[in-house]
């Protein structure tokens, strides 16, 4: 008597998530009498996938009619495949008895599920950094299979090379995750810059997924300060200007000090944007020279984006101002203690 063979012709089958998978199995003989059962996995922890005799298997249907006389084809179709269905499936022949006795197993068919990666999510640093500093951006995508995946980083369309990528887990799994961290050196011109994380996978048919992050969320461009004096007005008032230029973000507080005492505080708001995304702001202070006997030390103090204040001082020489109207002014910028603290 020829020994019964259980034939699973495919060693592996790959199916896209959502599709149906056909797992083929034929037997070489009609005897001995007994059922075929399908299992996922082997050993005591194996899961029963299909048993014609009993049980409810809504997603599994036999390919051919198993009740038909002389049927030797016990292939099954599993509908609406998900990554959780991945594994090795065994077609197992039992001999009829009480209970049925396991007789022979097929060699197994490994089902792998092709699943698309999720849209890449790019996150930037928690705190802003200034130009010339390096910041890290992280890109994450999940739920894809198979494991092979390509990830690229771009800054304003130019490919970046300083990044590190990990795909987890290392071994075989139903689905995988990718995490990549790119290091980007900031420049003062990066307010309008963008980093893009691009993920390519076999399931995407050459149309990669992209995640973006704006460098405007990561950068701080500290202001330049310049204090200048306009010519004396007819009413003995000197107009002193503090020009705050090329800063980002807009969050800025400017305080005028006269001889160390707070004269006025202003908050920047609704400023027009420069082409490069930075902002400028000009503040004026009128000083009544006739009200002072000595020189007046004016300080423009700027606190930008919660950083330590930056000062620029300027001395108005009272002695140099004759009291008659229309005379020229002689002003001297004494305070060059500008501090840019990052």
């Amino acid at each position: 008597e020829e020994e019964l063979q259980v034939i699973q012709p495919e060693k592996s089958v790959s199916v896209a998530a959502g599709d149906s998978a056909t797992l083929n199995c034929t037997v070489s003989s009609l005897i001995p009498v007994g059922p075929i059962q399908w299992f996922r996995g082997a050993g005591p922890g194996r899961e029963l996938i299909y048993n014609l005799k009993e049980g409810h298997f809504p997603r599994v249907t036999p390919v051919s009619d198993p009740t038909k006389r002389n049927n030797m084809d016990f292939s099954i179709r599993i509908s609406n495949i998900t990554p959780a269905d991945a594994g090795t499936y065994y077609c197992v022949k039992f001999r009829k008895g009480s209970p049925d006795v396991e007789l022979k197993s097929g060699a197994g068919t490994e089902l792998s599920v092709r699943a698309k990666p999720s849209a890449p999510v790019v996150s930037g640093p928690a705190v802003r950094a200034t130009a010339e500093h390096t910041v890290s951006f992280t890109c994450e995508s999940h739920g894809f299979s198979p494991r092979d995946i390509t990830l690229k980083w771009f800054k304003n369309g130019n490919e970046l090379s300083d990044f590190q990528t990990n795909v987890d887990p290392a071994g075989k799994s139903v689905s995988y995750s990718i995490r990549s961290t790119a290091r980007v050196v900031l420049t003062r011109r990066d307010v309008h810059s963008q980093v893009i994380c691009e993920v390519a996978h076999v399931t995407l048919q050459g149309d990669p997924l992209r995640g973006t992050a704006n460098l405007s969320e990561a950068i701080r461009v500290p202001p330049f300060l310049e204090v200048t004096q306009q010519s004396m007005r007819a009413d003995n008032q000197v107009n002193v200007t503090c020009q705050v230029t090329k800063f980002y973000p807009q969050r800025l507080q400017l305080t005028w000090l006269e001889n160390g005492n707070v004269s006025r505080t202003e908050m920047a708001s609704a400023l027009p944007e420069n082409k490069d995304g930075t902002y400028n702001w000009t503040s004026w202070l009128l000083v009544n020279v006739s009200a002072h006997r000595d020189d007046v030390k004016l300080t423009c103090q700027v606190e930008h984006d919660g950083q330590p204040a930056v000062n620029k001082s300027f001395s108005v020489k009272v002695s140099a101002h004759p009291k008659e109207q229309g005379s020229n002014t002689a002003a001297e910028n004494t305070g060059t203690n500008e501090r840019n603290i990052y």
Partner: antibody, heavy 122, light 112 residues
Framework: QVQLQESGPGLVKPSETLSLTCTVS????????WSWIRQPPGKGLEWIGF???????FYQSSLKSRVTISLDTSKNQFSLKMTSVTAADTAVYYC????????????????WGQGTTVTVSS | DIVMTQSPLSLPVTPGEPASISCRSS???????????LDWYLQRPGQSPQLLIY???SRASGVPDRFSGSGSGTDFTLKISRVEAEDVGVFYC?????????FGQGTKVEIK
Amino acid sequence: QVQLQESGPGLVKPSETLSLTCTVSGGSIRDYYWSWIRQPPGKGLEWIGFIYYNGRTFYQSSLKSRVTISLDTSKNQFSLKMTSVTAADTAVYYCARVRAYSGIGLDGTDVWGQGTTVTVSS
Amino acid sequence: DIVMTQSPLSLPVTPGEPASISCRSSQSLLYSTGYTYLDWYLQRPGQSPQLLIYGGSSRASGVPDRFSGSGSGTDFTLKISRVEAEDVGVFYCGQALQTPLTFGQGTKVEIK
């Protein structure tokens, strides 16, 4: 080449919980059983239990009420927790991989960790 | 539970000579599929056990061919055709047919 590495405290007080982790490197968690086996000083091998990659667990009946084996596929790790330990639980604890190709049985414990000595003492 | 019994428990050997260890199970390890769920392990001094034989007679990867396993049902034998000095240690048989997995008491092989 698959390697297994046990980690966890070497000394546990009586009545406390023993916690060990086994890290799988160079291979996959899938399609295998992941086992804990112990060996008391000068004695033979005692199977504690194992977990299949699908999460199904099997335990030694005498230890079942005290033992939990869990799997973290994202970290390629599996763990053993044993509550209410006594001096009788002092042993070298091995994590190991058990193969299963087809059928109901298993095909040998083919990869073993180097073992970690756990002493139960106050 | 399936009880595994080994004999002898101690085996003095001479390098170059053959040696054999017996193992008996309390119930048959020959499954209906024709597969025998019996494994042999060697634990060298200070080391973890290593798989020598699985399925009653199949040599594990990297195991020298001087080791062979035989038997079926409840009686099994591990043979070493020519003992080498590196073969010293404790040999265990183990069944993998059903949980709990069980092992024999071990046979200590030492050079005479």
